[in-house]
């Protein structure tokens, strides 16, 4: 899977998008989850309703709502008071019994409120010199990971 | 009326190939994944892969990966099994089976089966 | 691979009996469990998904019940048409696993 980055700025909403076919996960659950580490476990965040014909209905876990748009075929994030803490890598699942297959790998990066005067080394998101495999270029209000880009900050 | 209607029973030598196939009628077929069974000489269920016709996704049991390659044609309703290299070992019924998945339980049962191919190898 | 157990592998039973077959999951399937009737020369048949669902057109005779590791499969009184071999098979992780079978006969 190819990685997807979204943009958004610290204290502000982010919504994240994952297109599916709607078919292909006919009757199937949603999830979000956060990966930890590189090789890590994917840690669900937040899922959609357990009764899938009410996936339209938005599930909230803390600052963070998921929605299934299960016809159109297009699950919906909301990472509401984005903070630096929320930067790294998630991926948008799809469940059936108790596996999950990855709807779309997601790369979040925290930008600095540009209004907000205090430090922003706290806020991190990759740099072009850090390495990635299989990401593509995809310009809006998100992105796909550059050639060279890695997901996760270089650790010590 | 839903029906996988498979194709006829094959005896082959060792280490000949085979491909079986299933015609799936009577609903859309790119919407369900298509998986194969087999059975064995008097014996159990065994699960071998899954395939999605409409993206062609697939997966395999760990002890069938490598040994045979599930195929579909979509174009023509028609999901495959096959083999490059048979072993007496495989000789036995193989079935293709429409996975459904149910609404309330976001897991998927075989509801249609295919009425079987039995697949004899011989010297 | 979740291993499936089924016990007893064979019973004896008569018409109008009340028959339990169980299947034991190597590891928590919560309900993701599945029933099958087999005759001779057939392609098995859905009776049972969800641990509890009843197949459309299955008779209500039959009911399943479990969660976790331990299933049942209970026929309320059996018909003649029931004698044949059933499988239990768990949908909760790939590869998708089955039962060894239990096989019904007359008595």
């Known amino acids: 899977h190819n990685t997807t980055v979204f943009q958004g700025v610290a204290g502000q909403s982010l919504q994240v998008s994952c297109p599916y076919d709607s078919m292909k996960h006919w009757g199937r659950r949603k999830a979000w989850c956060r990966q930890l580490g590189e090789k890590g476990p994917c840690q669900r965040v937040v899922s959609t309703h357990n009764l899938w014909l009410l996936s339209f209905l938005r599930r909230w876990n803390g600052s963070t709502a998921i929605t299934d748009d299960t016809l159109g075929g297009t699950l919906t994030i909301t990472l509401r008071n984005l903070q630096p803490h929320d930067a790294g890598l998630y991926q948008c699942q799809s469940l059936h019994g108790s596996e999950a297959d990855t709807l779309r790998k997601v790369l979040v990066e925290v930008l600095a409120d540009p209004l907000d005067h205090r430090d922003a080394g706290d806020l991190w998101f990759p740099g072009e010199s850090e390495s990635f495999e299989d990401a593509h270029v995809e310009h809006s209000i998100s992105r796909s990971l550059l050639e060279g880009e890695i997901p996760f900050p270089p650790t010590s | 009326e839903v029906q996988l209607v498979q194709s006829g029973a094959e005896v082959k030598k060792p280490g000949e190939s085979l491909k079986i196939s299933c015609k799936g009628s009577?609903?859309?077929?790119?919407?369900?994944?298509i998986a194969w069974v087999r059975q064995m000489p008097g014996k159990g269920l065994e699960w071998m892969g899954i395939?999605?016709?409409?993206?062609?996704?697939?997966r395999y049991a760990p002890s069938f990966q490598g040994q045979v390659t599930i195929s579909a044609d979509k174009s023509i309703s028609t999901a495959y099994l096959q083999w490059s290299s048979l072993k007496a070992s495989d000789t036995a019924m193989y079935f293709c089976?429409?996975?459904?998945?149910?609404?309330?339980?976001?897991?998927?049962?075989?509801?249609?089966w295919g009425q079987g191919t039995l697949v004899t190898v011989s010297s | 691979d979740i291993q499936m157990t089924q016990s007893p592998s064979s019973v004896s039973a008569s018409v109008g009996d009340r028959v339990t077959i169980t299947c034991r999951a190597s590891?928590?399937?919560?309900?993701?469990l599945a029933w099958y009737q087999q005759k001779p020369g057939k392609a098995p048949k859905l009776l049972i998904y969800?641990?509890?669902s009843l197949q459309r057109g299955v008779p209500s005779r039959f009911s399943g019940s479990g969660s976790g590791t331990d299933f049942t499969l209970t026929i309320s009184s059996l018909q003649p048409e029931d004698f044949a071999t059933y499988f239990c098979?768990?949908?909760?992780?790939?590869?998708?696993?089955f039962g060894q079978g239990t096989k019904l006969e007359i008595k």
């Open positions: 089976v429409r996975s459904r998945t149910f609404y309330y339980d976001s897991s998927d049962y075989f509801d249609y």
């Open positions: 009577g609903y859309s077929f790119t919407s369900y994944w």
């Open positions: 395939i999605y016709p409409g993206d062609s996704d697939t």
């Open positions: 590891q928590g399937i919560s309900s993701w």
């Open positions: 969800a641990a509890s």
């Open positions: 098979q768990q949908a909760d992780s790939f590869p998708r696993t």
